[in-house]
């Protein structure tokens, strides 16, 4: 997570900047929510722990044709050490429940938020 | 485009069972992970199950494992859901649905009434 650049400048974005931005922007899909997030999509809920930005895309990227999490997905491409392609699944990602994108980005922010506070920025 | 239909629902008695039924077009239905959502009277959604493309892999909410079983035939384009020990809070609309498809994909649903 040294080089997170062609979010929104051009060199290499230091962690808590390339982490201010994710927040900044999951802030605004939540805030910017009229109708259901996705037409209602449903992802696989994830564990907010280790390996936690990998599996997020792991279960957003399934998602196609919501122009309103492109931005996201883009973004926590540059978090993710690997390639990340729609159907592939890590073993940190257990799949034990879905729910709807909407609550994905909820849950996802508050603990973004929580790593922010606490200075965890990788 | 993506066309959903459920059938199969109605009023059963605590304890009772039903099976529903999904039929699918309009997409290759044996390269799609599937999906079944309830929405309960003046609830949300809730994710009930899914079943992997290859049938190899079949998950379940807590509150169902157990008594429901999720199970596909893609020589039919068609996706079941055998539900046994139904229980009052199983009242619900069930959805088939293309995962990771929005609502506008989903079939319009099947009432489940569990209700003595």
């Known amino acids: 997570l040294t080089c997170l650049g062609g979010f929104a400048s051009p060199g290499p974005v230091p962690p808590s900047t390339a982490l201010r931005e994710l927040i900044e922007e999951l802030v605004n899909i939540t805030q910017n929510q009229k109708a259901p997030l996705c037409n209602g999509s449903m992802v696989w809920s994830i564990n907010l722990t280790a390996g936690m930005y990998c599996a997020a895309l792991e279960s957003l990227i399934n998602v196609s044709g919501c122009s309103a999490i492109e931005k996201t997905q883009r973004m926590l491409s540059g978090f993710c050490p690997h390639k990340v392609s729609a159907g592939q699944f890590s073993s940190l990602h257990v799949r034990d429940t879905k729910i709807e994108v909407a609550q994905f980005v909820k849950d996802l922010l508050l603990h973004l938020k929580k790593l922010f506070r606490e200075g965890q920025f990788n | 485009g993506v066309q959903l239909l459920e059938s199969g629902g109605g009023l059963v008695q605590p304890g009772g069972s039903l099976r529903l039924s999904c039929a699918a077009s309009?997409?290759?239905?044996?390269?799609?992970?599937m999906d079944w959502v309830r929405q309960a009277p003046g609830k949300g959604l809730e994710w009930v199950s899914t079943?992997?493309?290859?049938?190899?892999?079949?998950y379940y909410a807590d509150s169902v494992k157990g008594r429901f079983t999720i199970s596909r035939d893609n020589s039919k384009n068609t996706l079941y859901l055998q539900m046994n020990s139904l229980r009052a809070e199983d009242t619900a609309v069930y959805y088939c649905?293309?995962?990771?498809?929005?609502?506008?994909?989903w079939g319009p649903g099947t009432l489940v009434t569990v209700s003595s």
């Open positions: 649905a293309k995962a990771y498809t929005g609502r506008s994909y």
């Open positions: 309009g997409f290759t239905f044996d390269s799609a992970e």
């Open positions: 079943i992997s493309p290859s049938r190899r892999g079949t």
